[in-house]
Amino acid sequence: KPSNEATGNVSHSGMKKEFLHELKAENIKKFLYNFTRTPHLAGTQNNFELAKQIHDQWKEFGLDLVELSHYDVLLSYPNKTHPNYISIINEDGNEIFKTSLSEQPPPGYENISDVVPPYSAFSPQGTPEGDLVYVNYARTEDFFKLEREMKISCSGKIVIARYGKVFRGNMVKNAQLAGAKGMILYSDPADYFVPAVKSYPDGWNLPGGGVQRGNVLNLNGAGDPLTPGYPANEHAYRHELTNAVGLPSIPVHPIGYDDAQKLLEHMGGPAPPDSSWKGGLKVPYNVGPGFAGNFSTQKVKMHIHSYTKVTRIYNVIGTLKGALEPDRYVILGGHRDAWVFGGIDPQSGAAVVHEIVRSFGTLKKKGRRPRRTILFASWDAEEFGLLGSTEWAEEHSRLLQERGVAYINADSSIEGNYTLRVDCTPLMYSLVYNLTKELQSPDEGFEGKSLYDSWKEKSPSPEFIGMPRISKLGSGNDFEVFFQRLGIASGRARYTKNWKTNKVSSYPLYHSVYETYELVVKFYDPTFKYHLTVAQVRGAMVFELANSIVLPFDCQSYAVALKKYADTIYNISMKHPQEMKAYMISFDSLFSAVNNFTDVASKFNQRLQELDKSNPILLRIMNDQLMYLERAFIDPLGLPGRPFYRHIIYAPSSHNKYAGESFPGIYDALFDISSKVNASKAWNEVKRQISIATFTVQAAAETLREVA
């Protein structure tokens, strides 16, 4: 029967108010405390116990169905009896210095036995010995600088790089390509120590013995290294370890800046190529290879004994069935596994998800179901390469590609306490802007003002005056499989630091033993007002996506984004005007497709305004066009060399998994093209990638046309 739209809207906004009002800072704090009592490393008993606890609590909160979804995936652990370390050895082979085997436990955690020592997950075993070369952040451009400008070879050397700027897996890949035989990663004070702030436990800075753990894979969206493309279940065919996807080929190990000081202080060779290579240690940052002067006979030796093991992991999947469109899924997911206590990553996110589930459950118990089905997920093994989310999505890919409306990610709720940070598909820009206008800002000096107001003032958009910044989705988190592989509209939100004044990479204690509950309570968010704001943003996004009669997606924002990305990639190409002319490279077709998309999107929006929302078939048709628009940007063949990155508009940068790149196929074809041996072949590939992008944009536009 026809619904009364006015009443519908009242109940929608009333229900939303009720949902948001139910979210409590005190509960988030309580949940965070509960989730951070012990380490929750993927594949361990502790993390299985937490999965069962979350399963039981979600059932109590009122979800219709909660299940544990398990997979047997490749994980990596240090050898308990044979610890990893790095030493300096003299000409007689005697160790004259050894890096520390573990971090000093934080106060109150001295008796917790299952803290995993710092290690680089998936490093192969090995004991390479040789001269050190300092490679800055080990970015592509750093190796270009070293090899091409400074004529320094890393072949057969052990390289040492400072964490920051890019994903550590990319650093290792670059070192391998440069011929290094081992790699040391360290946290430099310039990147992980903010001036005038004390070290933990007296402040939120990284102490000299603090170390960042992390995986060093280059999976490119594959999931479990042994079962790429398919779920790692009982029936799965597993590759041999020699054919596993993305494993590094050289030993890798992380250290803190106290140990790095000892390795770097006597480095020889030339000075750094420019001052951007200088960190915050009292060392010259000479590049090497090897040590200088009297120390030149000393070598560095790595001792890495970690091992890989197929291990069972557990996702928790909760379902709240939709009242009217149960076959349309809105997913809220975040991971549960942590390197140690996970005070920020992931439990500040998991605690928010828990409270959002509780609030939706409270509404359901009062008879207020969402219009669409909401799926809640507590992912396992995110730290080992986004494994839990990817395996689950692989198992349910056919359902997800047909029924998936949106995925909202919920890892760490905070990485600072300055302002909001949002990365999402352009389809969600309007949704995010609108809902932040309705939420209170938690920021000092913005009392009585909206979150939108404080956000736009503190983080203005570089393109659109008077609007806040929203960034592209990259990867390094559990939205990857949903967005980059399946083409499900995705978004993420968290509170962040002031990037203008605070130059540190991530937050200083990231992935260290010092990422505790106390860190959050004492230094980041004592009242949990920022956690509450993030819960409101994430919760409101899910609420709107699950309850709006018309999906809150704006295809015109995508049109604007496509135009910007086409301009950007054209400008990159035009740095080679002679070659563009010689090889007859034209972007006319791409601009034409973008213009067409813009025109079609505008007409679609006009029809949407005129839609009879009481006609369920017409409503479903237009909602499906909106839902499937993101899907239309998926190329089944994937990107060159990266079959699981299938989105033609966005992909994780080939040089930094964390960063998003637009028109990645064209971008990669153009990258460093002037040094390619076969110029004709290289420019031909640019041409091919332009044609793929053109076809994709044109095909996506077609999906928005009137259906008949």
């Epitope: 400008e149 400074m150 004529k151 060779g269 030339p270 000075a271 420019d274 001052s275 940052y285 200088a292």
Partner: antibody, heavy 123, light 108 residues
Framework: QVQLQESGPGLVKPSETLSLTCTVS??????????WGWIRQTPGKGLEWIGT???????YYNPSLKSRLSLYMDTSKQEFSLRLASVTAADTAVYYC???????????????WGQGTLVTVSS | DVEMTQSPATLSLSPGDRATLSCRAS??????LAWYQQKPGQAPRLLIY???TRAPGIPARFSGSGTGTEFTLTISSPKSEDSAVYYC??????????FGGGTKLEIK
């Protein structure tokens, strides 16, 4: 003691390449751990760092000159040289070869200077 | 680039008067600052490095101070042979290494 001596043509035509050589006496390049460079002085712009070399072949160029500049080192002759392409009247200056303070202190202060050679760019 | 600004442009003193020459950096250069003296027809000569360390053979009447962005070269009791142009130079940030425009000191 260590001495530096610049040599090269005093007059260069516009659009041509300026080439200067600095001969080092009293110190070995390849084992010293010092950095060797060039500085020029014009009445208009004062002292301007051009670039620096290390014996390993590492080079450090002033970005404003990088596209036109090449630095070379010949350890067997104890010489290092500068080539600046496409010169204009603005490149008229006294050119000094210099040594950075050291050894092993990187791109530090300049503790040793040649006496300088005037190069005029004119047709 | 880090801009180095020296003041005053010219300083005229009588022998024995304390000379204070200033140098300001457009951003912090820590203590990576040097002072040079240049007499007419000669190459510059290193006086001070590390903001305050005298180079070998430099008389004790020359002293340097400062850190970050503000630096001072002091000549406690100048002699007539100290008449010269004095330059500061930063080597914290490169490329490029940069010099100040100079202060001309005249000892009457």
């Amino acid at each position: 003691q260590v001495q530096l001596q610049e040599s090269g043509p005093g007059l260069v035509k516009p659009s041509e390449t300026l080439s200067l050589t600095c001969t080092v006496s009293g110190a070995s390049f390849s084992s010293s751990g010092y950095y060797w460079g060039w500085i020029r002085q014009t009445p208009g712009k004062g002292l301007e760092w051009i670039g620096t070399m290390f014996y390993s072949g590492a080079t450090y160029y002033n970005p404003s000159l990088k596209s036109r500049l090449s630095l070379y080192m010949d350890t067997s002759k104890q010489e290092f040289s500068l080539r600046l392409a496409s010169v204009t009247a603005a490149d008229t200056a006294v050119y000094y070869c210099v040594r950075h303070r050291g050894p092993d202190t990187g791109l530090d202060a300049f503790d040793l200077w040649g006496q300088g050679t005037l190069v005029t760019v004119s047709s | 680039d880090v801009e180095m600004t020296q003041s005053p442009a010219t300083l005229s003193l009588s022998p024995g008067d304390r000379a204070t020459l200033s140098c300001r950096a457009s951003q912090s250069v820590s203590s990576d600052l040097a002072w040079y003296q240049q007499k007419p027809g000669q190459a510059p000569r290193l006086l001070i490095y590390g903001a305050s360390t005298r180079a070998p053979g430099i008389p004790a009447r020359f002293s340097g101070s400062g850190t970050g962005t503000e630096f001072t070269l002091t000549i406690s009791s100048p002699k007539s042979e100290d008449s010269a142009v004095y330059y500061c130079q930063q080597y914290n940030y490169w490329p490029p290494l940069t010099f100040g425009g100079g202060t001309k000191l005249e000892i009457k």
